[in-house]
């Protein structure tokens, strides 16, 4: 707790300005009126006061607003947000797209902090509805969002924000969450050319159908082993040898590293090991000659 | 209202010293840091040196630092460059201005020529 | 060579905007407020724009200024005859414990 001091002759605040970085902690405590700072919170981001001053002028803040700051302060917060914490930003009710854009900056560059998760969660419920704007925004600064998002969330995420993905911002989707972003980055990559087009699509073919895996098999695209091992299981079965040779292009001999694992494993045990002999990995497991292959959904229930 | 006027330029051989002195009025001079910047003969501007209101630290530019000192008198509302070992690139008009981060006040200047 | 660039002359016909850009570095402009100064001829210079984007009393809202990333732009729109003169930004660098300059850029009036 600062002290309560009464503040020096002369040195009443008139205004936030660089004068203020040479007062003492007591000194901010006693000189500045809080109604003051709130007015004038835009400049508190130009002036480079220490981390101990900010801690002073946030406690002014606090005890003028115990019931949570109103959204013209917030907007104007700059670095000072970092100061807040969760418990504090609970206390807000953000509306304004332009408050979010203007704090999420400020933590640019930075994995999601608990104040930004507790900011973003504030700011939606606050809407009612995660709307193309907001995801717009949010994807913008952190494309790894999405894969915190419900499927039923997920499904109002426009194409155009698809643009936004880096293939390691997927790397916690689960396959409901690829299933449902998967058609959106088809729709968004849909007018590039064949190899840029799999450059993009390739982090999303984890929800990719049997179907669209043939036509890319149909392209020479080479997809590596890492991005075939993330492919639904049930899209790859039903791949025939050919169409995997082709899919995998020179990555194809990591298969026999891989035969042991979902989905090569569950995939060897559908083809005619003929089939897989023409491979010349030395890959075992599949049906001899002369047997029947079982339907999948009566394979399953067996196994 | 603010005003800041510079004195003591003049000509001087190189080697030699001046204190420059420059009186404030129609602020708090004690709530603020002060500065020194200089202007060459149609050159820009160069930030010299800076002071905060306590004196408690002092900043320089490289090319005066070791050779100049400032400092100021809160209570004459006065700030000061003590300027030794001159040479002709010192030559400028040397302003004193309000603040260190924002200038937000100029005085008029005052010519220092550094010639033999 | 100045720690912040700038071009060295800009010009305009009058009523038209003129922006003049200021580059610097992730220690100074990147982490600092930027200030923009006007220098008349024959007259010291005078505070155009104070943290980033703030007008002093008395300086018309044809000057505006603004800040993004390392970089900063000062406006002038609706140019005069009378705002032929030199402008210069400015930003605080600690990396060097010292104020900073821009080269300066004269801007005419054609």
């Known amino acids: 707790e600062v002290e309560k001091t009464a503040c020096p002759s002369g040195k009443k605040a008139r205004e936030i300005d660089e004068s203020l970085i040479f007062y003492k902690k007591w000194e901010l405590e006693a000189c500045v009126d809080a109604a003051l700072l709130a007015t004038q919170m835009d400049r508190v981001n130009a002036i480079p006061f220490t981390y101990e001053q900010l801690d002073v002028l946030k406690h002014k803040l606090d005890e003028l607003y115990p019931q949570g700051y109103p959204e013209s302060v917030i907007q104007h917060l700059g670095y000072l947000f970092l100061k807040m914490s969760p418990e504090d930003i609970r206390k807000w009710n953000v509306t304004s797209l332009e408050t979010l854009k203007a704090l999420l900056e400020v933590n640019k560059g930075h994995e999601m902090s608990p104040q930004v998760a507790t900011l973003i969660d504030r700011f939606v419920k606050g809407r009612g509805q995660l709307d193309k704007d907001t995801l717009d925004t949010l994807t913008a600064f952190y494309p790894g969002y999405l894969c915190s998002l419900s499927p039923e969330e997920l499904s109002s995420v426009p194409p155009s924000s698809i643009w936004a993905v880096r293939p390691q911002d997927l790397d916690t989707c689960d396959p409901r969450q690829l299933d449902v972003l998967y058609p959106k980055a088809r729709l968004a990559f849909q007018n590039m050319n064949g190899s840029e087009y799999f450059v993009k699509i390739q982090s999303f073919l984890g929800g990719a159908p049997t179907e669209d895996l043939k036509a890319l098999s149909q392209q020479n695209v080479s997809m590596d082993l890492a991005t075939f091992m993330k492919l639904r299981t049930d899209a790859v079965l039903p791949l025939t040898v050919a169409e995997v040779q082709k899919l995998l292009g020179p990555h194809v001999e990591g298969l026999k590293a891989e035969e042991r694992h979902r989905p090569v494993r569950d995939w060897i045990l559908r083809q005619r090991q003929d089939d897989l002999d023409t491979l010349g990995l030395g890959l075992q497991g599949g049906i001899p000659n002369g047997y029947l292959v079982l339907d999948l959904s009566m394979q399953e229930a067996l196994s | 209202e603010v005003q800041l006027l510079e004195s003591g330029g003049g000509l001087v051989q190189p080697g030699g010293s001046l204190r420059l002195s420059c009186a404030a009025s129609?602020?708090?001079?004690?709530?603020?840091?002060m500065s020194w910047v200089r202007q060459a003969p149609g050159k820009g501007l160069e930030w010299v040196s800076g002071i905060p209101p306590d004196s408690a630290s002092k900043y320089y530019a490289d090319s005066v630092r070791g050779r100049f000192t400032v400092s100021r008198d809160n209570s004459k509302n006065t700030l000061y460059l003590q300027m030794n070992s001159l040479r002709a690139e010192d030559t400028a008009v040397y302003y004193c201005a309000k603040n260190m981060l924002s200038f937000d006040y100029w005085g008029q200047g005052t010519l220092v020529t550094v010639s033999s | 060579q100045s720690v912040l660039t700038q071009p060295p002359s800009a010009s305009g016909t009058p009523g038209q905007r003129v922006t003049i850009s200021c580059t610097g570095s992730?220690?100074?402009?990147?982490?600092?407020?930027v200030s923009w100064y006007q220098q008349l001829p024959g007259t010291a210079p005078k505070l155009l724009i104070y943290y980033n984007s703030k007008r002093p009393s008395g300086v018309p809202d044809r000057f505006s200024g603004s800040k993004s990333g390392t970089s900063a732009s000062l406006a002038i729109s609706g140019l005069r005859s009378e705002d032929e003169a030199d402008y210069y930004c400015?930003?605080?660098?600690?990396?060097?414990?010292?104020?900073?300059f821009g080269g300066g850029t004269k801007v005419t009036v054609l």
């Open positions: 992730s220690s100074n402009i990147g982490s600092n407020a």
């Open positions: 129609g602020f708090t001079f004690s709530n603020y840091a």
């Open positions: 400015g930003s605080w660098d600690p990396s060097l414990n010292g104020y900073v």
